[in-house]
């Protein structure tokens, strides 16, 4: 049991995890397999489930981070946060109840996820016992981006981060001292979690605006297999 000031993780129950504490892709957990009579997932449910799957992965990664360092209780995070340009939802992005705008919001979600990719790459060598989960979060985020890109009417408005800038940022982050690397890991996980939560709320407002084709096997489709990428 442990606690951090970002939330209470004492009841760390994760929907898509099996007994080995490994992430199970949506559609592959025992609940899905045991319910062949269930209706196939709709497109919006697919995306919804994919985001929740990623969030569960983040939850597991944060558990390891908070257990091995005191970053989760640190009051110095504001200082470190100023040096990171992590994507964040704001009123102008059209994703909140007030001033909601489907198109603007969808562009923000995709742009934000693309911007997070470099930070997810940074996370890949930051975990010992949760290495697979870090990889799963990264790969399933790529799939989520693809799902959403298929549905964005205004693809021109989506700015893709510059690979050279990303490579330079990655080098800079990896060159930090141990304390700053731990803090960076904590801040990335916290910010990514918040961004996905905001996205989930917004996508639920959109409802069936999102329509990813559902294959004939319904809910049994693997959501995060690398072959899909």
């Amino acid at each position: 049991d442990y606690k951090d000031h970002d939330g209470d993780y004492k009841d760390h129950d994760i929907d898509y995890k099996d007994d080995d504490d490994k992430l199970v892709p949506p559609g592959e957990d025992s609940k899905d397999v045991a319910a062949p009579h269930r209706q196939p997932l709709t497109s919006s449910e697919r995306i919804d489930k994919q985001i929740r799957y990623i969030l569960d992965g983040i939850s597991a990664l944060r558990k390891e981070t908070c257990n091995k360092s005191n970053m989760c209780e640190s009051s110095k995070e504001a200082l470190a946060e100023n040096n990171l340009n992590l994507p964040k939802m704001a009123e102008k992005d059209g994703c909140f109840q007030s001033g909601f705008n489907e198109e603007t919001c969808l562009v923000k979600i995709i742009t934000g996820l693309l911007e997070f990719e470099v930070y997810l790459e940074y996370l890949q060598n930051r975990f010992e016992s949760s290495e697979e989960q870090a990889r799963a979060v990264q790969m399933s985020t790529k799939v989520l981006i693809q799902f959403l890109q298929k549905k964005a009417k205004n693809l021109d408005a989506i700015t893709t981060p510059d690979p050279t800038t990303n490579a330079s940022l990655l080098t800079k982050l990896q060159a930090q001292n141990q304390w700053l690397q731990d803090m960076t890991t904590h801040l990335i996980l916290r910010s990514f979690k918040e961004f996905l939560q905001s996205s989930l709320r917004a996508l639920r407002q959109m409802g069936d605006l999102i329509s990813v084709p559902v294959d004939s096997r319904g809910s049994e489709q693997k959501l995060i297999s690398e072959e899909d990428l």
């Epitope: 000031h5 939330g7 209470d8 449910e45 709320r201």
Partner: antibody, heavy 118, light 109 residues
Framework: QSLEESGGRLVTPGTPLTLTCTAS????????MSWVRQAPGKGLEWIGY?????STYYANWAKGRFSISKTSTTVDLKMTSLTAEDTATYFC???????????????WGPGTLVTVSS | YDMTQTPASVEVAMGGTVTIKCQAS??????LSWYQQKPGQPPKLLIY???TLASGVSSRFKGSGSGTEYTLTISGVECADAATYYC????????????FGGGTEVVVV
């Protein structure tokens, strides 16, 4: 960890009123927070949430008349154009943040009574 | 996303079993919580995500359901279980009148 509401009192119809919820033992900035009310002898009625991303969501009936804001130690509920129907005990509650959007309310204050009467 | 709770009131004998139902107007993907409220007290979280018991809650309380239909079952009812029980959807907070059901009063006889 605890929450305590304050500011409830007897007011006349049309009077604006602000209720404050104060946290002890934790920082509110890391949690989704909610206001819920309960008229005498009635059920729970959700007013709204303020999330960690600073966004606010309100019940359809509360939009425009109720407003939620937050600091690291307090959550305020601003109410305008009060009528007798707004007479209720007002609770603030903390959302659990261990997961995604499952906004369960795992810590509640004792409530503060607002009476609207002429 | 309206939540309809039934029955409004139920009498149960000590040691008996009581079942409370909650129906959502649309699927809420198992994001449903149950609360217990006693007179003069704030609500207390009992169950979240349909079936997970909150810390310190007796295993006599059991939650189940999926999609739009959810159930709270209290077995081996005790005097202390006399209270009003509410369901709450945690799925969507947009275009909602109330995230809570209307409540069920459990009277132990």
């Amino acid at each position: 960890q605890s929450l305590e509401e304050s500011g409830g009192r007897l007011v006349t119809p049309g009077t604006p009123l602000t209720l404050t919820c104060t946290a002890s033992g934790f920082s509110l900035s890391s949690y989704d927070m909610s206001w819920v009310r309960q008229a005498p002898g009635k059920g729970l009625e959700w007013i709204g949430y303020i999330y960690t991303d600073t966004s606010t969501y309100y019940a359809n009936w509360a939009k425009g008349r109720f407003s939620i804001s937050k600091t690291s130690t307090t959550v305020d509920l601003k109410m305008t154009s009060l009528t007798a129907e707004d007479t209720a005990t007002y609770f603030c509650a903390k959302g659990s943040t261990d997961y995604a959007f499952d906004t369960r309310l795992d810590l509640w204050g004792p409530g503060t009574l607002v009476t609207v009467s002429s | 996303y309206d939540m309809t709770q039934t029955p409004a009131s139920v009498e149960v004998a000590m040691g008996g079993t009581v079942t409370i139902k909650c129906q959502a107007s649309q699927s809420i993907s198992n994001e449903l919580s149950w609360y217990q409220q006693k007179p003069g007290q704030p609500p207390k979280l009992l169950i979240y995500r349909t079936s997970t018991l909150a810390s310190g809650v007796s295993s006599r309380f059991k939650g189940s359901g999926s999609g739009t239909e959810y159930t709270l079952t209290i077995s081996g009812v005790e005097c202390a279980d006399a209270a009003t029980y509410y369901c709450q959807q945690g799925y969507n907070s947009n275009d909602v009148d109330n995230v809570f059901g209307g409540g069920t009063e459990v009277v132990v006889v």
